[in-house]
Protein backbone atom coordinates (compact mmCIF):
# COMPACT_ATOMS: atom_id res chain seq x y z
CA UNK A 1 0.00 0.00 0.00
CA UNK A 2 1.27 3.40 -0.49
CA UNK A 3 2.39 5.05 3.08
CA UNK A 4 3.24 8.55 1.44
CA UNK A 5 -0.49 9.32 3.10
CA UNK A 6 0.25 8.38 6.37
CA UNK A 7 0.69 10.44 9.38
CA UNK A 8 4.33 10.82 10.68
CA UNK A 9 5.36 10.86 14.26
CA UNK A 10 9.50 10.87 15.49
CA UNK A 11 10.48 8.74 18.38
CA UNK A 12 13.93 8.96 20.11
CA UNK A 13 14.95 5.88 22.28
CA UNK A 14 18.01 6.66 24.33
CA UNK A 15 18.83 3.26 26.38
CA UNK A 16 21.12 2.86 28.84
CA UNK A 17 23.95 0.23 27.89
CA UNK A 18 24.22 -0.81 32.00
CA UNK A 19 21.03 -2.27 31.86
CA UNK A 20 17.97 -4.20 30.31
CA UNK A 21 15.05 -1.90 29.61
CA UNK A 22 12.40 -2.54 27.08
CA UNK A 23 10.56 0.14 24.50
CA UNK A 24 7.28 0.28 22.67
CA UNK A 25 5.72 1.70 20.08
CA UNK A 26 1.47 2.80 19.82
CA UNK A 27 -0.06 2.71 16.53
CA UNK A 28 -1.76 6.49 17.09
CA UNK A 29 -4.00 6.67 14.62
CA UNK A 30 -6.56 9.30 14.95
CA UNK A 31 -9.50 8.57 16.57
CA UNK A 32 -12.55 10.55 15.59
CA UNK A 33 -15.25 7.76 15.72
CA UNK A 34 -14.91 4.99 18.25
CA UNK A 35 -17.29 2.64 15.57
CA UNK A 36 -14.37 2.97 12.70
CA UNK A 37 -10.18 3.46 12.68
CA UNK A 38 -10.01 6.92 11.10
CA UNK A 39 -11.47 8.84 8.30
CA UNK A 40 -9.42 11.82 8.36
CA UNK A 41 -10.27 12.52 4.76
CA UNK A 42 -14.01 13.72 5.95
CA UNK A 43 -12.57 16.05 9.29
CA UNK A 44 -12.99 19.79 8.75
CA UNK A 45 -9.59 21.23 9.98
CA UNK A 46 -11.36 22.29 13.28
CA UNK A 47 -12.35 18.77 13.80
CA UNK A 48 -8.88 17.81 15.04
CA UNK A 49 -8.96 14.31 16.09
CA UNK A 50 -6.86 13.09 19.62
CA UNK A 51 -4.24 10.79 19.28
CA UNK A 52 -4.46 8.46 21.40
CA UNK A 53 -3.32 4.71 21.18
CA UNK A 54 -6.50 2.82 21.23
CA UNK A 55 -7.28 -0.33 23.32
CA UNK A 56 -10.22 -1.80 24.47
CA UNK A 57 -12.24 -3.18 21.85
CA UNK A 58 -11.89 -6.13 19.32
CA UNK A 59 -11.98 -3.71 16.62
CA UNK A 60 -9.13 -1.76 17.62
CA UNK A 61 -6.45 -4.47 18.22
CA UNK A 62 -6.47 -5.46 14.76
CA UNK A 63 -3.88 -3.48 13.88
CA UNK A 64 -0.34 -4.72 11.04
CA UNK A 65 2.86 -3.45 11.60
CA UNK A 66 5.60 -3.15 9.26
CA UNK A 67 8.83 -2.09 8.79
CA UNK A 68 10.18 0.05 6.30
CA UNK A 69 13.86 -0.80 5.28
CA UNK A 70 16.02 1.23 4.87
CA UNK A 71 17.33 0.64 1.22
CA UNK A 72 13.83 1.08 -0.22
CA UNK A 73 12.73 -3.06 -0.26
CA UNK A 74 9.07 -3.24 -0.03
CA UNK A 75 7.53 -3.28 3.53
CA UNK A 76 8.46 -6.14 5.80
CA UNK A 77 5.39 -7.89 8.37
CA UNK A 78 7.26 -7.02 11.68
CA UNK A 79 5.74 -10.70 12.77
CA UNK A 80 7.65 -12.25 10.29
CA UNK A 81 10.96 -11.03 10.42
CA UNK A 82 11.89 -9.51 13.80
CA UNK A 83 11.51 -12.10 17.20
CA UNK A 84 12.46 -9.65 19.68
CA UNK A 85 9.81 -7.21 18.58
CA UNK A 86 6.30 -8.66 20.02
CA UNK A 87 2.69 -7.53 18.97
CA UNK A 88 0.23 -6.77 21.20
CA UNK A 89 -2.83 -5.45 20.54
CA UNK A 90 -2.22 -2.03 19.31
CA UNK A 91 1.61 -1.95 21.06
CA UNK A 92 4.67 -2.89 19.29
CA UNK A 93 6.68 -4.32 22.19
CA UNK A 94 10.89 -3.80 21.67
CA UNK A 95 12.35 -6.76 23.93
CA UNK A 96 15.82 -5.49 23.34
CA UNK A 97 17.74 -2.01 23.10
CA UNK A 98 20.48 -1.65 20.27
CA UNK A 99 20.44 0.90 17.36
CA UNK A 100 19.53 -1.61 15.06
CA UNK A 101 15.79 -1.22 15.70
CA UNK A 102 16.01 2.24 14.29
CA UNK A 103 14.05 2.63 11.45
CA UNK A 104 10.85 3.00 10.31
CA UNK A 105 7.97 1.38 11.62
CA UNK A 106 4.82 1.75 10.20
CA UNK A 107 0.87 0.55 11.41
CA UNK A 108 -2.11 0.85 9.57
CA UNK A 109 -5.71 -1.63 10.17
CA UNK A 110 -6.22 -4.98 8.84
CA UNK A 111 -9.52 -4.58 7.76
CA UNK A 112 -10.38 -1.27 5.41
CA UNK A 113 -14.09 -0.85 6.50
CA UNK A 114 -14.17 2.43 3.67
CA UNK A 115 -12.13 3.92 0.93
CA UNK A 116 -11.52 6.90 3.52
CA UNK A 117 -9.39 4.15 5.55
CA UNK A 118 -7.24 3.56 2.93
CA UNK A 119 -4.56 6.63 4.19
CA UNK A 120 -5.79 5.48 7.51
CA UNK A 121 -1.98 4.86 8.71
CA UNK A 122 1.04 6.10 10.92
CA UNK A 123 4.59 6.24 10.07
CA UNK A 124 6.48 5.95 13.39
CA UNK A 125 10.67 7.31 12.88
CA UNK A 126 12.06 5.48 15.28
CA UNK A 127 16.29 6.60 16.21
CA UNK A 128 17.87 4.59 18.57
CA UNK A 129 20.95 5.89 20.92
CA UNK A 130 23.10 4.64 23.92
CA UNK A 131 22.99 6.79 26.37
CA UNK A 132 26.57 8.99 25.58
CA UNK A 133 26.30 12.03 28.58
CA UNK A 134 27.43 10.45 32.04
CA UNK A 135 25.78 13.96 33.03
CA UNK A 136 23.45 12.53 35.15
CA UNK A 137 24.68 10.33 37.55
CA UNK A 138 21.74 8.60 39.33
CA UNK A 139 19.53 9.09 36.54
CA UNK A 140 16.14 6.70 37.44
CA UNK A 141 16.00 2.71 36.57
CA UNK A 142 14.00 1.25 33.72
CA UNK A 143 12.58 -0.67 37.40
CA UNK A 144 10.85 0.48 39.78
CA UNK A 145 9.60 -0.46 42.70
CA UNK A 146 6.64 1.00 44.73
CA UNK A 147 5.97 -0.24 48.67
CA UNK A 148 2.63 -1.31 49.08
CA UNK A 149 0.45 1.26 51.57
CA UNK A 150 3.09 4.05 51.42
CA UNK A 151 3.98 7.17 49.48
CA UNK A 152 5.76 6.18 46.24
CA UNK A 153 6.31 7.85 43.06
CA UNK A 154 7.50 6.74 39.33
CA UNK A 155 10.11 8.64 37.74
CA UNK A 156 10.69 8.85 33.94
CA UNK A 157 14.53 7.89 33.52
CA UNK A 158 15.11 10.44 30.79
CA UNK A 159 14.15 13.03 32.78
CA UNK A 160 15.07 12.42 36.52
CA UNK A 161 18.43 14.40 36.88
CA UNK A 162 16.26 17.20 35.55
CA UNK A 163 15.56 20.12 38.08
CA UNK A 164 11.72 20.68 38.74
CA UNK A 165 12.06 24.29 37.13
CA UNK A 166 13.66 22.77 33.76
CA UNK A 167 11.58 19.26 33.15
CA UNK A 168 9.95 19.78 30.05
CA UNK A 169 5.77 18.79 29.57
CA UNK A 170 5.72 14.97 30.66
CA UNK A 171 2.58 12.58 28.80
CA UNK A 172 2.37 8.95 30.90
CA UNK A 173 0.92 6.18 29.80
CA UNK A 174 -0.20 3.41 32.16
CA UNK A 175 -0.70 -0.27 30.22
CA UNK A 176 -1.29 1.67 27.17
CA UNK A 177 -3.87 3.98 28.64
CA UNK A 178 -2.83 7.64 28.77
CA UNK A 179 -2.72 9.38 31.73
CA UNK A 180 -4.39 12.39 31.10
CA UNK A 181 -3.78 14.47 34.47
CA UNK A 182 -0.14 13.57 34.90
CA UNK A 183 2.07 15.87 33.36
CA UNK A 184 4.91 16.45 35.15
CA UNK A 185 8.76 14.04 34.95
CA UNK A 186 7.36 12.21 38.15
CA UNK A 187 3.96 10.47 38.98
CA UNK A 188 3.37 10.95 42.60
CA UNK A 189 1.40 8.23 44.33
CA UNK A 190 -0.24 9.22 48.21
CA UNK A 191 -0.83 5.78 48.67
CA UNK A 192 0.33 2.64 46.75
CA UNK A 193 -2.26 -0.28 46.32
CA UNK A 194 -1.18 -3.50 43.83
CA UNK A 195 -3.20 -1.56 40.59
CA UNK A 196 0.17 0.86 40.46
CA UNK A 197 1.92 -2.16 39.40
CA UNK A 198 2.01 -2.43 34.87
CA UNK A 199 4.28 -0.70 32.30
CA UNK A 200 4.46 3.45 31.99
CA UNK A 201 5.69 5.05 29.32
CA UNK A 202 6.86 8.99 29.81
CA UNK A 203 6.80 11.11 26.83
CA UNK A 204 8.22 14.77 25.81
CA UNK A 205 8.78 16.58 22.95
CA UNK A 206 12.28 17.90 22.12
CA UNK A 207 12.34 20.73 19.52
CA UNK A 208 15.43 22.46 17.66
CA UNK A 209 13.00 24.94 16.19
CA UNK A 210 13.04 23.12 12.89
CA UNK A 211 10.90 20.68 13.66
CA UNK A 212 10.28 18.30 16.74
CA UNK A 213 10.03 14.78 18.06
CA UNK A 214 8.75 12.62 20.89
CA UNK A 215 12.08 11.28 23.71
CA UNK A 216 10.30 8.02 25.24
CA UNK A 217 10.73 6.05 28.28
CA UNK A 218 9.81 2.82 29.41
CA UNK A 219 9.38 2.01 33.09
CA UNK A 220 8.19 -1.41 34.50
CA UNK A 221 6.80 -0.79 37.90
CA UNK A 222 6.28 -3.38 40.85
CA UNK A 223 4.87 -3.12 43.78
CA UNK A 224 6.72 -4.90 46.66
CA UNK A 225 6.46 -5.13 50.23
CA UNK A 226 8.72 -4.02 52.63
CA UNK A 227 11.85 -6.31 52.92
CA UNK A 228 11.53 -8.89 55.71
CA UNK A 229 13.08 -8.54 58.99
CA UNK A 230 13.29 -12.23 59.60
CA UNK A 231 15.56 -15.29 58.50
CA UNK A 232 14.49 -18.07 56.15
CA UNK A 233 12.31 -20.57 58.31
CA UNK A 234 12.62 -24.26 57.33
CA UNK A 235 9.49 -25.97 56.36
CA UNK A 236 11.02 -29.54 55.54
CA UNK A 237 12.48 -31.37 56.78
CA UNK A 238 10.39 -30.98 60.06
CA UNK A 239 12.04 -34.23 61.27
CA UNK A 240 15.70 -34.66 62.75
CA UNK A 241 15.28 -38.19 62.03
CA UNK A 242 14.33 -40.46 58.81
CA UNK A 243 13.43 -43.84 58.60
CA UNK A 244 15.43 -45.40 55.51
CA UNK A 245 16.16 -48.62 53.63
CA UNK A 246 19.13 -50.09 53.32
CA UNK A 247 20.60 -50.14 49.81
CA UNK A 248 17.70 -48.18 48.62
CA UNK A 249 17.63 -44.49 46.50
CA UNK A 250 16.48 -41.90 48.69
CA UNK A 251 15.85 -38.59 47.95
CA UNK A 252 15.99 -35.54 51.17
CA UNK A 253 13.76 -32.72 50.37
CA UNK A 254 14.46 -28.74 51.64
CA UNK A 255 11.94 -26.65 51.69
CA UNK A 256 12.15 -23.10 53.16
CA UNK A 257 10.53 -20.26 53.32
CA UNK A 258 12.20 -16.49 52.40
CA UNK A 259 10.60 -13.33 53.08
CA UNK A 260 10.58 -10.55 50.21
CA UNK A 261 13.64 -8.47 49.77
CA UNK A 262 14.15 -6.02 47.36
CA UNK A 263 18.01 -7.22 46.72
CA UNK A 264 17.46 -11.22 46.92
CA UNK A 265 20.39 -13.74 47.35
CA UNK A 266 18.81 -16.62 48.40
CA UNK A 267 21.20 -19.83 49.88
CA UNK A 268 20.28 -23.06 50.04
CA UNK A 269 22.11 -25.68 50.81
CA UNK A 270 22.81 -29.64 51.49
CA UNK A 271 26.24 -30.70 53.87
CA UNK A 272 27.13 -33.52 55.20
CA UNK A 273 28.43 -33.91 58.88
CA UNK A 274 30.61 -36.91 59.41
CA UNK A 275 31.87 -37.25 63.10
CA UNK A 276 35.06 -34.45 62.63
CA UNK A 277 34.33 -33.48 59.27
CA UNK A 278 31.66 -31.21 57.18
CA UNK A 279 31.50 -31.03 53.51
CA UNK A 280 28.91 -29.02 51.04
CA UNK A 281 27.40 -31.68 48.79
CA UNK A 282 26.77 -31.06 44.53
CA UNK A 283 23.07 -31.34 44.30
CA UNK A 284 20.54 -30.33 41.64
CA UNK A 285 19.45 -26.82 41.90
CA UNK A 286 17.39 -24.64 44.02
CA UNK A 287 13.87 -24.07 42.33
CA UNK A 288 10.76 -21.80 43.58
CA UNK A 289 7.91 -23.70 44.16
CA UNK A 290 5.86 -20.98 44.89
CA UNK A 291 6.20 -16.95 44.83
CA UNK A 292 3.43 -14.46 45.87
CA UNK A 293 4.44 -11.34 47.16
CA UNK A 294 5.38 -11.31 51.00
CA UNK A 295 7.36 -14.55 50.18
CA UNK A 296 9.22 -17.43 48.23
CA UNK A 297 9.21 -20.79 49.14
CA UNK A 298 12.49 -22.43 47.42
CA UNK A 299 13.08 -26.53 47.56
CA UNK A 300 16.42 -28.11 47.47
CA UNK A 301 16.80 -31.79 46.87
CA UNK A 302 20.07 -34.39 48.08
CA UNK A 303 19.73 -37.43 46.19
CA UNK A 304 21.37 -40.43 47.73
CA UNK A 305 21.93 -43.56 44.92
CA UNK A 306 21.26 -45.96 47.65
CA UNK A 307 21.40 -45.61 51.34
CA UNK A 308 24.39 -47.30 52.58
CA UNK A 309 25.50 -48.49 56.20
CA UNK A 310 28.12 -45.29 55.95
CA UNK A 311 25.52 -42.94 56.17
CA UNK A 312 23.87 -43.90 58.90
CA UNK A 313 26.63 -42.62 61.03
CA UNK A 314 26.11 -39.36 58.89
CA UNK A 315 23.88 -36.21 59.84
CA UNK A 316 22.57 -34.49 56.20
CA UNK A 317 21.93 -30.80 57.32
CA UNK A 318 20.26 -27.95 55.32
CA UNK A 319 21.49 -24.66 55.41
CA UNK A 320 19.22 -21.71 54.49
CA UNK A 321 20.41 -18.10 54.64
CA UNK A 322 19.02 -14.13 53.56
CA UNK A 323 20.77 -10.96 54.37
CA UNK A 324 19.26 -11.37 57.89
CA UNK A 325 20.53 -14.33 59.19
CA UNK A 326 20.72 -18.49 58.61
CA UNK A 327 18.38 -21.20 59.83
CA UNK A 328 19.69 -25.03 59.91
CA UNK A 329 17.75 -28.81 59.90
CA UNK A 330 19.91 -31.35 60.14
CA UNK A 331 18.67 -35.19 59.19
CA UNK A 332 19.80 -38.34 60.97
CA UNK A 333 19.13 -41.70 58.74
CA UNK A 334 18.08 -44.76 60.48
CA UNK A 335 17.23 -47.88 59.11
CA UNK A 336 13.50 -49.37 59.22
CA UNK A 337 13.05 -51.73 61.35
CA UNK A 338 10.95 -55.37 60.26
CA UNK B 1 -0.33 31.00 17.34
CA UNK B 2 -1.03 32.93 20.40
CA UNK B 3 -3.39 35.48 21.85
CA UNK B 4 -3.76 37.58 25.35
CA UNK B 5 -6.44 39.41 26.06
CA UNK B 6 -8.31 41.62 29.27
CA UNK B 7 -5.89 44.51 29.02
CA UNK B 8 -7.84 47.62 29.99
CA UNK B 9 -7.92 50.87 31.64
CA UNK B 10 -7.89 50.01 35.18
CA UNK B 11 -7.64 52.33 38.78
CA UNK B 12 -5.10 51.62 41.20
CA UNK B 13 -5.96 49.01 43.70
CA UNK B 14 -8.25 46.57 41.13
CA UNK B 15 -7.58 43.03 40.56
CA UNK B 16 -7.62 42.25 36.54
CA UNK B 17 -6.99 39.05 35.57
CA UNK B 18 -5.52 38.57 30.91
CA UNK B 19 -6.11 35.58 29.30
CA UNK B 20 -3.79 33.53 27.07
CA UNK B 21 -5.38 31.35 24.28
CA UNK B 22 -3.84 28.87 21.56
CA UNK B 23 -4.70 27.85 18.18
CA UNK B 24 -2.68 25.22 16.38
CA UNK B 25 -1.15 23.39 19.16
CA UNK B 26 -2.70 22.16 22.19
CA UNK B 27 -1.93 24.14 25.37
CA UNK B 28 -2.51 22.07 27.83
CA UNK B 29 0.75 19.92 26.18
CA UNK B 30 2.80 23.44 26.72
CA UNK B 31 4.52 25.43 29.65
CA UNK B 32 3.60 28.99 29.38
CA UNK B 33 5.01 32.09 30.31
CA UNK B 34 4.22 35.51 30.73
CA UNK B 35 6.49 38.54 29.78
CA UNK B 36 5.47 42.35 30.45
CA UNK B 37 7.15 45.56 28.62
CA UNK B 38 6.35 49.20 30.29
CA UNK B 39 6.08 52.04 27.41
CA UNK B 40 9.76 52.79 26.26
CA UNK B 41 11.06 49.96 28.36
CA UNK B 42 12.68 46.28 28.44
CA UNK B 43 11.20 42.85 28.83
CA UNK B 44 10.14 41.90 32.33
CA UNK B 45 10.02 37.91 33.13
CA UNK B 46 7.02 37.89 35.39
CA UNK B 47 6.47 33.69 35.45
CA UNK B 48 5.75 30.33 33.81
CA UNK B 49 3.04 27.76 34.59
CA UNK B 50 3.95 24.05 33.67
CA UNK B 51 1.69 21.86 31.92
CA UNK B 52 1.24 19.75 35.19
CA UNK B 53 0.17 23.36 36.72
CA UNK B 54 3.47 23.89 38.81
CA UNK B 55 3.96 27.80 38.84
CA UNK B 56 7.37 29.98 38.90
CA UNK B 57 7.63 33.30 39.45
CA UNK B 58 10.25 35.98 39.20
CA UNK B 59 11.03 37.65 43.22
CA UNK B 60 9.44 40.99 42.14
CA UNK B 61 6.09 39.53 40.92
CA UNK B 62 5.04 36.90 43.62
CA UNK B 63 2.46 37.50 45.44
CA UNK B 64 1.91 40.83 43.20
CA UNK B 65 1.01 38.17 40.05
CA UNK B 66 -0.99 35.02 40.38
CA UNK B 67 -0.84 32.37 37.51
CA UNK B 68 -3.15 29.48 36.54
CA UNK B 69 -4.54 27.66 33.34
CA UNK B 70 -7.07 25.70 32.38
CA UNK B 71 -7.50 23.37 29.51
CA UNK B 72 -8.06 26.57 27.67
CA UNK B 73 -6.35 29.67 28.84
CA UNK B 74 -3.82 30.51 31.06
CA UNK B 75 -4.04 33.22 33.13
CA UNK B 76 -2.23 36.00 34.22
CA UNK B 77 -3.90 37.70 37.67
CA UNK B 78 -2.93 40.60 38.53
CA UNK B 79 -3.63 41.06 42.47
CA UNK B 80 -4.02 44.69 43.29
CA UNK B 81 -2.89 46.85 40.29
CA UNK B 82 -0.48 49.85 40.75
CA UNK B 83 0.61 52.62 38.45
CA UNK B 84 4.17 50.82 37.79
CA UNK B 85 1.79 47.62 36.44
CA UNK B 86 1.23 50.02 33.09
CA UNK B 87 2.50 47.56 30.75
CA UNK B 88 1.91 45.58 27.49
CA UNK B 89 1.52 41.87 28.81
CA UNK B 90 3.21 39.23 26.64
CA UNK B 91 2.28 35.45 27.02
CA UNK B 92 4.55 33.15 25.05
CA UNK B 93 5.08 29.54 24.68
CA UNK B 94 8.15 27.36 26.00
CA UNK B 95 9.36 24.77 23.72
CA UNK B 96 11.92 22.49 25.09
CA UNK B 97 15.70 21.41 23.05
CA UNK B 98 16.50 19.24 25.86
CA UNK B 99 18.34 18.46 29.36
CA UNK B 100 21.60 19.34 28.61
CA UNK B 101 19.67 23.58 27.11
CA UNK B 102 16.75 24.16 29.09
CA UNK B 103 13.55 25.78 28.11
CA UNK B 104 13.51 29.15 25.03
CA UNK B 105 10.33 31.42 24.66
CA UNK B 106 9.51 30.40 20.58
CA UNK B 107 6.16 31.65 19.99
CA UNK B 108 4.66 35.02 21.29
CA UNK B 109 1.05 36.82 20.97
CA UNK B 110 0.83 40.24 20.14
CA UNK B 111 0.40 41.75 23.79
CA UNK B 112 -2.56 43.04 25.65
CA UNK B 113 -1.77 46.48 26.96
CA UNK B 114 -3.24 47.36 30.95
CA UNK B 115 -3.06 50.93 31.65
CA UNK B 116 -3.36 51.34 35.38
CA UNK B 117 -4.50 55.20 36.45
CA UNK B 118 -6.75 56.99 38.40
CA UNK C 1 17.98 37.73 41.62
CA UNK C 2 19.42 36.67 38.46
CA UNK C 3 20.92 39.74 36.17
CA UNK C 4 22.09 39.96 32.29
CA UNK C 5 23.99 43.01 31.71
CA UNK C 6 23.87 44.18 28.35
CA UNK C 7 26.41 46.15 26.20
CA UNK C 8 26.58 49.06 24.43
CA UNK C 9 23.65 50.46 24.17
CA UNK C 10 22.69 52.34 21.70
CA UNK C 11 24.77 50.87 18.74
CA UNK C 12 24.67 52.15 15.41
CA UNK C 13 26.08 50.39 11.95
CA UNK C 14 26.23 50.86 8.58
CA UNK C 15 24.76 48.88 6.13
CA UNK C 16 26.71 45.87 5.08
CA UNK C 17 28.83 46.46 8.73
CA UNK C 18 28.85 44.03 11.68
CA UNK C 19 27.60 44.49 14.64
CA UNK C 20 28.36 42.58 18.44
CA UNK C 21 26.38 42.84 21.37
CA UNK C 22 27.50 41.71 24.75
CA UNK C 23 25.83 39.94 27.51
CA UNK C 24 27.04 39.25 31.11
CA UNK C 25 24.78 37.26 33.18
CA UNK C 26 25.75 37.56 37.37
CA UNK C 27 25.67 34.39 37.43
CA UNK C 28 26.28 31.05 35.05
CA UNK C 29 23.35 30.01 33.06
CA UNK C 30 21.54 26.59 33.06
CA UNK C 31 24.43 23.78 31.38
CA UNK C 32 26.48 27.08 30.57
CA UNK C 33 24.18 27.60 27.50
CA UNK C 34 20.25 28.70 28.19
CA UNK C 35 21.04 31.96 26.93
CA UNK C 36 18.19 33.27 23.63
CA UNK C 37 18.89 36.45 22.03
CA UNK C 38 15.54 38.08 20.90
CA UNK C 39 14.36 40.60 18.10
CA UNK C 40 11.60 43.02 18.92
CA UNK C 41 10.64 45.84 16.67
CA UNK C 42 8.70 48.61 17.37
CA UNK C 43 4.47 47.46 17.70
CA UNK C 44 5.59 43.72 17.79
CA UNK C 45 6.27 41.27 19.95
CA UNK C 46 9.51 39.76 20.38
CA UNK C 47 10.93 37.05 18.20
CA UNK C 48 13.64 34.34 19.06
CA UNK C 49 16.43 34.34 16.88
CA UNK C 50 19.20 32.17 18.85
CA UNK C 51 19.12 29.37 21.31
CA UNK C 52 21.35 27.32 23.39
CA UNK C 53 23.75 30.45 23.23
CA UNK C 54 24.28 29.84 19.39
CA UNK C 55 21.43 27.91 17.87
CA UNK C 56 19.93 29.39 14.90
CA UNK C 57 16.01 29.46 15.10
CA UNK C 58 14.06 28.10 12.27
CA UNK C 59 13.65 30.91 9.65
CA UNK C 60 16.35 33.39 10.98
CA UNK C 61 19.13 34.65 8.35
CA UNK C 62 22.54 33.26 8.55
CA UNK C 63 23.94 36.53 9.36
CA UNK C 64 23.02 36.35 13.29
CA UNK C 65 25.13 34.36 15.04
CA UNK C 66 25.49 33.47 18.78
CA UNK C 67 28.49 32.73 20.68
CA UNK C 68 29.57 32.18 24.36
CA UNK C 69 29.16 29.93 27.39
CA UNK C 70 28.36 30.39 31.34
CA UNK C 71 28.22 34.32 32.10
CA UNK C 72 29.73 35.59 29.10
CA UNK C 73 27.47 35.72 25.49
CA UNK C 74 28.04 37.34 22.28
CA UNK C 75 25.59 38.72 19.32
CA UNK C 76 26.67 39.24 16.19
CA UNK C 77 24.77 40.76 12.86
CA UNK C 78 27.38 40.31 10.34
CA UNK C 79 26.38 42.57 6.92
CA UNK C 80 23.91 44.39 8.42
CA UNK C 81 20.80 45.50 6.71
CA UNK C 82 17.78 47.97 7.06
CA UNK C 83 15.78 45.41 8.09
CA UNK C 84 17.30 44.42 11.55
CA UNK C 85 16.73 47.64 13.26
CA UNK C 86 15.13 46.39 16.31
CA UNK C 87 16.21 46.66 20.10
CA UNK C 88 17.95 43.06 20.90
CA UNK C 89 17.59 41.18 24.55
CA UNK C 90 19.70 38.33 25.90
CA UNK C 91 17.66 35.61 27.93
CA UNK C 92 19.05 33.38 30.23
CA UNK C 93 17.16 30.24 31.76
CA UNK C 94 18.50 29.23 35.48
CA UNK C 95 18.00 26.06 37.50
CA UNK C 96 15.97 27.85 40.18
CA UNK C 97 12.42 27.70 41.97
CA UNK C 98 12.76 31.25 41.50
CA UNK C 99 13.58 34.23 38.77
CA UNK C 100 13.97 30.74 36.44
CA UNK C 101 14.44 33.32 33.51
CA UNK C 102 15.87 36.84 33.10
CA UNK C 103 15.82 39.67 30.58
CA UNK C 104 18.67 41.83 29.33
CA UNK C 105 18.15 45.31 29.30
CA UNK C 106 17.98 44.95 25.80
CA UNK C 107 20.10 46.70 23.00
CA UNK C 108 18.81 49.19 20.50
CA UNK C 109 20.77 48.79 16.92
CA UNK C 110 20.31 51.61 14.34
CA UNK C 111 20.78 50.96 10.58
CA UNK C 112 22.32 54.29 9.11
Known amino acids: FNISGCSTKKLLWTYSTRSEEEFVLFCDLPEPQKSHFCHRNRLSPKQVPEHLPFMGSNDLSDVQWYQQPSNGDPLEDIRKSYPHIIQDKCTLHFLTPGVNNSGSYICRPKMIKSPYDVACCVKMILEVKPQTNASCEYSASHKQDLLLGSTGSISCPSLSCQSDAQSPAVTWYKNGKLLSVERSNRIVVDEVYDYHQGTYVCDYTQSDTVSSWTVRAVVQVRTIVGDTKLKPDILDPVEDTLEVELGKPLTISCKARFGFERVFNPVIKWYIKDSDLEWEVSVPEAKSIKSTLKDEIIERNIILEKVTQRDLRRKFVCFVQNSIGNTTQSVQLKEKRG | SVEESGGRLVTPGTPLTLTCTAS????????MCWVRQAPGKGLEWIGFIKADGNTYYATWAKGRFTISRSSATVDLKITSATAEDTATYFCARMFYAGHTSGHYFDLWGPGTLVTVSS | AQVLTQTPSPVSAAVGGTVTINCQASQSVYNNKNLAWYQQKPGQPPKLLIYDASKLASGVPLRFSGSGSGTQFTLTISGVQCDDAATYYCAGGYDSSVDTFAFGGGTEVVVK
Open chain 2, 24 to 31: GFSLSSYH
